[in-house]
Amino acid sequence: SSSPTSSASSFSSSAPFLASAVSAQPPLPDQCPALCECSEAARTVKCVNRNLTEVPTDLPAYVRNLFLTGNQLAVLPAGAFARRPPLAELAALNLSGSRLDEVRAGAFEHLPSLRQLDLSHNPLADLSPFAFSGSNASVSAPSPLVELILNHIVPPEDERQNRSFEGMVVAALLAGRALQGLRRLELASNHFLYLPRDVLAQLPSLRHLDLSNNSLVSLTYVSFRNLTHLESLHLEDNALKVLHNGTLAELQGLPHIRVFLDNNPWVCDCHMADMVTWLKETEVVQGKDRLTCAYPEKMRNRVLLELNSADLDCDPILPPSLQTS
């Protein structure tokens, strides 16, 4: 049977002297930028590990998949990919590991087909609230983005400009309500301590949310109720101690959800009873048989599914007169 997938093709490396010779002219349709490899058949351009300091100006108009990974871009200015004619076919853009520390408002404007954007492994000290929406209007034109990969974009502590990193990222996600169509959001490995309570409610199309390898301690103030189409929720490798009834009920109410909870420091005391009961009954937690207690010491490495109510006690709180320091 026929398929819409492109055939694999060999990449053509451009000759640097040729590129520089024509840089003052409009790019030729099949031209390949210096230090890049291009395959028109696969509609792919790869400018990988070349220490580029800016986005090539002479990208071929046919490009559908653009890899600009492992460079030294530092800043993405407004209209970084705006071209005449526009890169109308560009659907997947990977900028991971390119030492970006600033992404300015409108950096991805004039990319009408951009569906997948990966900014992972860049120390984004300054992510404009309007990086994805392109304007400061209260309601922007909808972004075509379907997948946004922002894993490990937290900058070093000393570069965080005395503001909440979580807040900066969330502001960019919510600005102008441009990302209403976003289906996959990855925010792994960002040292998040909390999840601002309004973020999920304003991303109603989410199917996949990856918050793994952060420092989330609690989900008490996070509501999943609006995410009726959520299919996978990754919460592995956080600092979660227990999930409370409200969260359990919300997760259970999502018809297709798969939740991943491995490697959290579960506290197996009396507050864990509801979660243990829920785990024994639910099908939404993948790998639930791997979940183990971290605290208290006497419960360490016990499997949550094997606990019963008698195991889950809390030390009685002594009246002040009987407490010892």
């Epitope: 398929s3 569906r115 997948q116 169509g181 289906r183 996959r184 990754h234 018809p255």
Partner: antibody, heavy 124, light 107 residues
Amino acid sequence: EVQLVESGGGLVQPGGSLRLSCAASGFTFSNYWMNWVRQAPGKGLEWVGEIRLKSDKYATYYAESVKGRFTISRDDSKNSLYLQMNNLKTEDTGVYYCARRRGYYGSAYGMDYWGQGTLVTVSS
Amino acid sequence: DIQMTQSPSSLSASVGDRVTITCKASQDINSYLSWFQQKPGKAPKILIYRANRLVDGVPSRFSGSGSGKDFTFTISSLQPEDIATYYCLQYDFLPLTFGGGTKVEIK
């Protein structure tokens, strides 16, 4: 050339079990969400379930009609997809197809390649 | 679950006729809709994806249109080899759901 070849179909009694396989070739199997779809004799197509990628921890999703009875698994090293069917019912009779789906939410295509199918008959 | 209501369930047309099939989704599925052709004893074959994009190698007499809830599949000039059952598929939401099919016959 992309190929999907199902096997393992046959006659089984109600309450019995069967394991279907789907051998994939001609593409990078590990990059695709893989699906099972079935078709009862003379009827339309019904989605059975899907398994995602290693990066998705091989998450599985099922139609309500097979939940708890069917299990989808995959072995990327063998380019193979499986469907373990337990507690089979007469209404599970039909041709079972495996089909691939691009492993990302911006995918344009839905299911673009299908196998030729394998017939499962559940009857006493 | 998204219901896909496909009509008509069968039709008979002459060679050269224009044939139109519709699929209506119970809620907005954007443009995440494919059309398939299935001949007796064969696997379904994808013809159209993203509601209106023709798969490479598929004859240009096949076309698709629509977005949101209402979609149309058209064969501009029916050929004898087009005798088959045609299905729509929505892949925006789980579970993935198919239309009931339209059997196309030659008069």
